[in-house]
Interface confidence: low
C-alpha cells in the first residue's frame, strides 16, 4: 500500500543515522553473554571465516546477511538459551536486537538491493540515443569519467 | 579445462598489481582524443551520472560495467571513429585497451562475481552442524565477528 511505501522511504532516510546505535545495541546485548560463551569455546578453528565477509560485501550480500540472521535466530540462539538459565534472558535480548535490525533492513530496499533492478545503464543509453550525433561527443568526452568509475569498481573488488 | 583454470588463477593473482597500469594505458589512450571530443561537446548536462557509479559499486556492478564496456565498444566508438580520419587510429587504440580490460575481467571470476554462486553461509551451517553442541559456543562466541560483518555490509551500503 502507499502507506507502506512512505514508511519504507522514511526508514531509508533515518536508517544510516540509526546504524551506529543499532550496532551499539547489538554489541551491548552481546557483551552480557560474551564472556560466558567465549570461555566455553575451546575450539581454535573459525566458524565465521573471511569468505562470509566477502559474501556480505559481494553481490549476494543481502541474501547472505538475511540467511545468517535467520541462522542465528532460528538455530543458534534457541539452543544457546537452553545452556544456562542465567543467560537465557540476555540471549533473548540479543535476539530481539537482531530482529529489530532485520525489520529495518526489510523496510528499506536500499539495504536489500537484491530485490531491486538497476536502471542506470538503461538511462545512459536512452540519454545517448536522444542526443543523436551529439551523444557521441558527449559519451567520448566523458570517457575519463568512465575510467574513474571503472577504477572505483575495481578498487572496491580488490578491497572486498 | 585445467589450463584455463590455471590461467584464471594467474590472472586473479596478477590483476590487482596490473590494475594501475591498465588504467594508465586507458587514460593515455584517451588523452590523445580527449581535446578533440571535449571541444566538440557543447552540452552542459552529464551523461555518466553518479547513479551509474552507484550501480558499479552495487550488487549489479559487474553487469553494469560489462554492459557499459559493450556500449562504448559497440555503439559509441564505431560512430566516433567515423568523425575524423586523424583520430580514427586513436579511438581504435582506446577500444583495444578497453577490450584488454574486459578480457582480464572475464578471466577472473573475482571481478565478475555475478557469474558465481555463494557458498559461505552453507559452509558456516555445515561446520556448525558438525561441531554439534560445541557449535553453539563457537557461533555465539563469534557473534562479535558477525556484528563486524554486518557493520561492514551496512557501511558499504551507506557509502554506495
Amino acid at each position: 500500500s502507499p502507506g507502506q511505501g512512505t514508511q519504507s522511504e522514511n526508514s531509508c532516510t533515518r536508517f544510516p543515522g540509526n546504524l551506529p546505535h543499532m550496532l551499539r545495541d547489538l554489541r551491548d546485548a552481546f557483551s552480557r553473554v560474551k564472556t560466558f560463551f567465549q570461555m566455553k569455546d575451546q575450539l581454535d578453528n573459525i566458524l565465521l571465516k573471511e569468505s562470509l565477509l566477502e559474501d556480505f560485501k559481494g553481490y549476494l550480500g543481502c541474501q547472505a546477511l538475511s540467511e545468517m540472521i535467520q541462522f542465528y535466530l532460528e538455530e543458534v540462539m534457541p539452543q544457546a538459551e537452553n545452556h544456562d538459565p542465567d543467560i537465557k534472558e540476555h540471549v533473548n535480548s540479543l535476539g530481539e536486537n537482531l530482529k529489530t535490525l532485520r525489520l529495518r533492513l526489510r523496510r528499506c530496499h536500499r539495504f536489500l538491493p537484491c530485490e531491486n533492478k538497476s536502471k542506470a545503464v538503461e538511462q545512459v543509453k536512452n540519454a545517448f540515443s536522444k542526443l543523436q550525433e551529439k551523444g557521441v561527443y558527449k559519451a567520448m568526452s566523458e570517457f575519463d569519467i568512465f575510467i574513474n568509475y571503472i577504477e572505483a569498481y575495481m578498487t572496491m573488488k580488490i578491497r572486498n | 579445462s585445467p589450463g584455463q583454470g590455471t590461467q584464471s588463477e594467474n590472472s586473479c593473482t596478477r590483476f590487482p598489481g596490473n590494475l594501475p597500469h591498465m588504467l594508465r594505458d586507458l587514460r593515455d589512450a584517451f588523452s590523445r582524443v580527449k581535446t578533440f571530443f571535449q571541444m566538440k561537446d557543447q552540452l552542459d548536462n552529464i551523461l555518466l551520472k553518479e547513479s551509474l557509479l552507484e550501480d558499479f559499486k552495487g550488487y549489479l556492478g559487474c553487469q553494469a560495467l560489462s554492459e557499459m564496456i559493450q556500449f562504448y565498444l559497440e555503439e559509441v566508438m564505431p560512430q566516433a571513429e567515423n568523425h575524423d580520419p586523424d583520430i580514427k587510429e586513436h579511438v581504435n587504440s582506446l577500444g583495444e585497451n578497453l577490450k584488454t580490460l574486459r578480457l582480464r575481467l572475464r578471466r577472473c571470476h573475482r571481478f565478475l562475481p555475478c557469474e558465481n554462486k555463494s557458498k559461505a553461509v552453507e559452509q558456516v551451517k555445515n561446520a556448525f552442524s558438525k561441531l554439534q553442541e560445541k557449535g553453539v559456543y563457537k557461533a555465539m562466541s563469534e557473534f562479535d565477528i558477525f556484528i563486524n560483518y554486518i557493520e561492514a555490509y551496512m557501511t558499504m551500503k551507506i557509502r554506495n
Epitope: L23, R27, I46, K49, E50, R159 | N148
Partner: antibody
Framework: EVQLVESGGGLVRPGGSLRLSCTAS????????MAWVRQSPDKGLEWVAS????????YYRDSVRGRFTISRNNAKTTLYLQMDSLRSEDTATFYC????????????WGQGVMVTVSS | DIQMTQSPSLLSASVGDRVTLNCKTS??????LAWYQQKLREPPKLLIF???PLQAGIPSRFSGSGSGTDFTLTITSLQPEDVATYFC????????FGPGTKLELK
C-alpha cells in the same frame, strides 16, 4: 599451542634478494589468512603483505608491490615472502602473523626475523 | 590511509597505579581496533580486539574501550610485568598501527 617460526633473514646488499619462510604449527593453517608485518625503529610497525587462506588473492603495501611476493604452501603449513630489489629502507624485523580475514585483527605473531639491507 | 596517533608516547607509573593509554584515528573505524603489548626483544602480543573484548589468557586488569576515532586501553593495577610498549592497530581499512606508548616503572 599456536607457533609461527620465521627463518631466512640476514644481511643483503641493496638490489639483492632474500626469501623469508614461516613454519606454522598448533592450528589449521589452511583456515587462516596470513600476513607479513615489519618493524623498524624509524617507521614502527608496517603491514607488508597478506595472502588469503587458499592463496587465491595477494595484497601488498604500495612501497613493496612489484618487488615482494607473498605465497604459501598449505600442505607444508609454510608462508613465504620473496623479497627482490631490496632497499635500505626495507631494513626491519619481519614478523609472520595470522588473521581471520581482512577486517579482522592479527592474533598471533612469530618471534620475527631480522633483515638488514646495507652496502 | 588511516593515520593513528597514541598518547602519551612515554608513560612512567608505579606498581598498583591505574594507567590509561590513548589511541586516536584519523577517521571513524567503528570498533575495528586491537591493542598489542610488546616487551623488549619479543613480538607484539594481542591483548584486546574489537576495541573491548579481552583475548583469551590476558589478565582481567587490562580493558579496552572506545569507538569511532577515540580509544583507550586501561590497566587497573599496574604490575612489574606490564612494562612494555603498547600499540593500537586498526583493521577497518587496510592495516595500520599506532607509533606506540612506552610504559615504564617510576
Amino acid at each position: 599451542e599456536v607457533q609461527l617460526v620465521e627463518s631466512g633473514g640476514g644481511l643483503v646488499r641493496p638490489g639483492g634478494s632474500l626469501r623469508l619462510s614461516c613454519t606454522a604449527s598448533g592450528f589449521t593453517f589452511s583456515d587462516y589468512h596470513m600476513a607479513w608485518v615489519r618493524q623498524s625503529p624509524d617507521k614502527g610497525l608496517e603491514w607488508v603483505a597478506s595472502i588469503t587462506l587458499d592463496a587465491t588473492y595477494t595484497y601488498y603495501r604500495d612501497s613493496v608491490r612489484g618487488r615482494f611476493t607473498i605465497s604459501r604452501n598449505n600442505a607444508k603449513t609454510t608462508l613465504y615472502l620473496q623479497m627482490d630489489s631490496l632497499r635500505s629502507e626495507d631494513t626491519a624485523t619481519f614478523y609472520c602473523t595470522r588473521h581471520r580475514g581482512f577486517s579482522v585483527w592479527l592474533d598471533y605473531w612469530g618471534q620475527g626475523v631480522m633483515v638488514t639491507v646495507s652496502s | 590511509d588511516i593515520q593513528m596517533t597514541q598518547s602519551p608516547s612515554l608513560l612512567s607509573a608505579s606498581v598498583g597505579d591505574r594507567v590509561t593509554l590513548n589511541c586516536k584515528t584519523s577517521q571513524n573505524i567503528f570498533e575495528n581496533l586491537a591493542w598489542y603489548q610488546q616487551k623488549l626483544r619479543e613480538p607484539p602480543k594481542l591483548l584486546i580486539f574489537n576495541a573491548s573484548p579481552l583475548q583469551a589468557g590476558i589478565p582481567s586488569r587490562f580493558s579496552g574501550s572506545g569507538s569511532g576515532t577515540d580509544f583507550t586501553l586501561t590497566i587497573t593495577s599496574l604490575q612489574p610485568e606490564d612494562v612494555a610498549t603498547y600499540f593500537c592497530h586498526q583493521y577497518y581499512s587496510g592495516y595500520t598501527f599506532g607509533p606506540g606508548t612506552k610504559l615504564e616503572l617510576k
